[in-house]
């Protein structure tokens, strides 16, 4: 906390600028007004200030605004941001998408934060749903960010948001959440043709039921052995020898180095062995 | 790059248990969840359990009633309580966050 101290002679910041570097911490408490710098803030990030003073800025808005600072000046916080803790965030009420990209860049590079996931969750409760323009701003600064949601907060994805999904998003979602995601996948997806259509659904097919990848295997689709390793056991089991060889097409040989794991492990003995002698892979039911 | 560092596994007999820890590296905030994988000797890898951004869980059906999965913010940690080990849960276990994954700890049943 920085003792109340009058301001020296002529030493009264009339802006913000490259001089107030050199005052000391009493003096950039005493002469540099509250809501200059809050009018100012866009500048603050071009100075070369130390932690310190940093600190000493960051009191005066928290004085100005002790319920929390506006968004005008949120979106020029700059490096000040690092400087917030959780509970100065949650106080914000931040609505600008804008706003939210300024401070995500000034963190970039960093990890998640405290502060960030702070920020994060209090823009997407003020949007109320998680559209398309925050997913694609949240994935391109965290891809994982998709599957950190629980299938509950994922049920409350729009279907058009998912055209922001990017296969690498779905990196780590688990088989629960992509039971939530792939029903909004085929959603969203469903006026494309079926070529471009398995393109893009392809990477939500974990969470796929048997009906749809008997509907794929009439396609041509040629689905290769890392999409059909992912795929849920239970909508593989149903399939018959003939829908998994037109499922993967010349992909089919595959089957045979992924013979003791799953889905195929299990597949292959729910097959009768003549069924599968058709393949001629050698497979042992 | 968010680092990730996996502990806790070790040799048990089969009914014992075990507890693995994730730990996230700086000022990492394990608020936005984190997973454990995985990977037995000559298998694909497969999810075990979750834990969300919004606390709740979620475990593959086999290990659900046997393991559970909680996290500590104040350190930055995710844990993996497992009990009553069958020889077919050995594997070397990953933890993975926001699309970073650790190294692994390996976790040996015996009988």
């Known amino acids: 906390e920085v003792e109340k101290t009058a301001c020296p002679s002529g030493k009264k910041a009339p802006e913000i600028d490259e001089s107030l570097i050199f005052y000391k911490k009493w003096e950039l408490e005493a002469c540099v007004d509250a809501a200059l710098l809050a009018t100012q803030m866009d500048r603050v990030n071009a100075i070369p200030f130390t932690y310190e003073q940093l600190d000493v800025l960051k009191h005066k808005l928290d004085e100005l605004y002790p319920q929390g600072y506006p968004e005008s000046v949120i979106q020029h916080l700059g490096y000040l941001f690092l400087k917030m803790s959780p509970e100065d965030i949650r106080k914000w009420n931040v609505t600008s998408l804008e706003t939210l990209k300024a401070l995500l860049e000034v963190n970039k590079g960093h990890e998640m934060s405290p502060q960030v996931a702070t920020l994060i969750d209090r823009f997407v409760k003020g949007r109320g749903q998680l559209d398309k323009d925050t997913l694609d701003t949240l994935t391109a600064f965290y891809p994982g960010y998709l599957c950190s949601l629980s299938p509950e907060e994922l049920s409350s994805v729009p279907p058009s948001s998912i055209w922001a999904v990017r296969p690498q998003d779905l990196d780590t979602c688990d088989p629960r959440q992509l039971d939530v995601l792939y029903p909004k996948a085929r959603l969203a997806f469903q006026n494309m043709n079926g070529s471009e259509y398995f393109v893009k659904i392809q990477s939500f097919l974990g969470g796929a039921p048997t009906e749809d990848l008997k509907a794929l295997s009439q396609q041509n689709v040629s689905m290769d052995l890392a999409t059909f390793m992912k795929l849920r056991t239970d909508a593989v089991l149903p399939l018959t020898v003939a829908e998994v060889q037109k499922l993967l097409g010349p992909h089919v040989e595959g089957l045979k180095a992924e013979e003791r794991h799953r889905p195929v492990r299990d597949w292959i003995l729910r097959q009768r062995q003549d069924d599968l002698d058709t393949l001629g892979l050698g497979l042992q039911g | 790059q968010l680092q990730l560092v996996e502990s806790g596994g070790g040799l048990v007999q089969a009914g014992g248990s075990l507890r693995l820890s994730c730990t996230a590296s700086g000022s990492t905030s394990m608020s936005y969840g984190a997973k454990w994988f995985r990977r037995a000797p000559g298998k694909e890898r497969e999810w075990v359990a979750s834990?969300?951004?919004?606390?709740?869980?979620g475990y593959d059906d086999s290990v659900k009633g046997r393991f559970t999965i909680s996290r500590d913010l104040a350190k930055n940690t995710v844990y993996l309580q497992m009990n009553s080990l069958r020889l077919e849960d050995t594997a070397v276990y990953y933890c993975t966050a926001l699309n970073s994954w650790g190294q692994g700890t390996q976790v040996t049943v015996s009988s």
């Open positions: 834990v969300y951004r919004d606390g709740t869980t």
